[in-house]
Interface confidence: low
């Protein structure tokens, strides 16, 4: 296993409809066909995996169908979105990046991008 | 209805190895976190391993870091634990169980709502 940078925004801020989205960049060391992606939560001291997928340079990501990540990817880029958040979210999202194919098999995880989610406020009653 | 078959335990010396297997059936196995947990006689049951449902992320009780692994084959349904330079004191019965959520790896029991009925793991000389 061979270590590689990744790196990515320090900080996102939600939107209000609890999206968030942030670059995964990686120093491909060589010409990866083959690539995972898998963003870990952490806090609380606590570590989770929010999603994964494994892509073909050029092609769509593709998560699982319940996932709650969407993404492009565009040479060493990748473009990732996270839909249905809520304040309760709030934490340090890492981009994991694997190149899987060909050999040699290449890890880099990065410092990770703080997502601040904030819940919207319920409009207050109105006669308008 | 989710099931769970552990297998692989048996006898070994100290210093051996062994591979245990947790069958699964029911969807929920393979889209949920699994994890190990482990009861040694007169003692309560302790986590030991836990692993996301794509198998991305792994989770090992710190007695057991560098001697076992944790992992998975969602297209077979089932949870593997492999066990190097086995000690004495790694005797008890293992039990696989499948977490509540997907990705969240959790260290205590009642996060846990499927459970197997265990094998029987002796290290002794």
């Known amino acids: 296993c061979k270590a590689m940078h990744v790196a990515q925004p320090a900080v996102v801020l939600a939107s209000s409809r609890g999206i968030a989205s942030f670059v995964c960049e990686y120093a491909s060391p060589g010409k990866a066909t083959e690539v995972r992606v898998t963003v870990l939560r952490q806090a609380d001291s606590q570590v989770t995996e929010v999603c994964a997928a494994t892509y073909m340079m050029g092609n769509e990501l593709t998560f699982l169908d319940d996932s709650i990540c969407t993404g492009t990817s565009s040479g060493n880029q990748v473009n990732l979105t996270i839909q249905g958040l809520r304040a309760m979210d709030t934490g340090l999202y890492i981009c994991k990046v694997e190149l899987m194919y060909p050999p040699p098999y290449y890890l880099g995880i990065g410092n990770g991008t703080q997502i601040y989610v904030i819940d919207p406020e319920p409009c207050p009653d109105s006669d308008f | 209805e989710v099931q769970l078959v552990e297998s692989g335990g048996g006898l070994v010396q100290p210093g051996g190895s062994l591979r245990l297997s947790c069958a699964a059936s029911g969807r929920t196995a393979s889209s949920n976190a699994m994890a190990w947990f482990r009861q040694a006689p007169g003692k309560e049951r302790e986590f030991v391993s836990a692993?996301?449902?794509?198998?991305?992320?792994?989770a090992y009780a710190d007695s057991v870091k560098g001697r076992f692994t944790i992992s998975r084959d969602n297209s077979k349904n089932t949870l593997y634990l492999q066990m190097n330079s086995l000690r004495a004191e790694d005797t008890a019965v293992y039990y696989c169980?499948?977490?509540?959520?997907?990705?969240?790896?959790?260290?205590?029991?009642?996060?846990?709502?499927?459970w197997g009925q265990g094998t029987l793991v002796t290290v002794s000389s």
């Open positions: 692993i996301s449902a794509t198998g991305g992320l792994t």
């Open positions: 169980a499948v977490g509540r959520e997907r990705w969240y790896l959790r260290h205590t029991e009642n996060e846990y709502d499927y």
